[in-house]
Amino acid sequence: NKILVKQSPMLVAYDNAVNLSCKYSYNLFSREFRASLHKGLDSAVEVCVVYGNYSQQLQVYSKTGFNCDGKLGNESVTFYLQNLYVNQTDIYFCKIEVMYPPPYLDNEKSNGTIIHVKGKHLCPSPLFPGPSKP
């Protein structure tokens, strides 16, 4: 029995920040769980982790090079990624594991979300404007 995960197919980070919502076919209320966000087609790099249980507040971990926060809904975890770099454009997969109460559950692999980080292109005013036309 696997948890299903829904993610937006694509998100664009115009201001180097993005909210990625992972929606689950499972209610996380009063559960001990570990939600994580993985970068790359092979999910090789785990970049953010949200750990929650019934007795203490949510704990959020960010891998070095990532600035991450997490928010819990009844059937969702939203990862808020800030200070993203253009080279962090990639596909990101949500993962969830529920440890307690039994049985242990995890998710079917989702389709992932492509996060496209747009660089900030400032248009400077020209230093030497050409001759103005009458």
């Epitope: 001990e32 570990r34 994580s36 785990e46 982790v49 750990y51 971990y61 070095t64 594991e97």
Partner: nanobody
Framework: EVQLVESGGGEVQTGGSLRLSCAAS????????MGWFRQAPGKEREFVAA????????DYAESVKGRFTISRDNAKNTVYLEMNSLRAEDTAVYYC?????????????????WGQGTLVTVKP
């Protein structure tokens, strides 16, 4: 709830070796990291080494690189710290830590659970 039990500390001469072990028990997820920190008298607890579950990510403090090796046996939920070429400044209480982060974190605040500590004394 995770419990950590360290062993292997003791007294050794300068240049000697020790192997510390830390066994974890309790509810474990498929990915987590474990690390070693140490605290000398009157000093802050400092990072020594850490390793993730897949054993493809390990990190060391500069002061122990090339002398200490961290490893783990996932079947036994145990992490080891092999300490060679020990120096007087390695004398400290060594603590094992557990984090739900899936990478070898050197940040003390990332660690949720700690062992009781094991004393390592290096005699000149």
């Amino acid at each position: 709830e995770v419990q950590l039990v360290e062993s292997g500390g003791g007294e050794v001469q300068t240049g000697g070796s020790l192997r510390l072990s830390c066994a974890a028990s309790g509810r474990m997820f498929s990915n987590y990291a474990m690390g070693w920190f140490r605290q000398a008298p009157g000093k802050e607890r400092e990072f020594v080494a850490a390793i993730n579950y897949r054993r493809d990510d390990a990190d060391y403090a500069e002061s122990v690189k090339g002398r200490f090796t961290i490893s783990r046996d996932n079947a036994k939920n145990t992490v080891y710290l092999e300490m060679n070429s020990l120096r007087a400044e390695d004398t400290a209480v060594y603590y094992c830590g557990f984090t739900y982060a899936g990478w070898a974190s050197s940040r003390r605040d990332d660690y949720n659970y700690w062992g009781q500590g094991t004393l390592v004394t290096v005699k000149p």
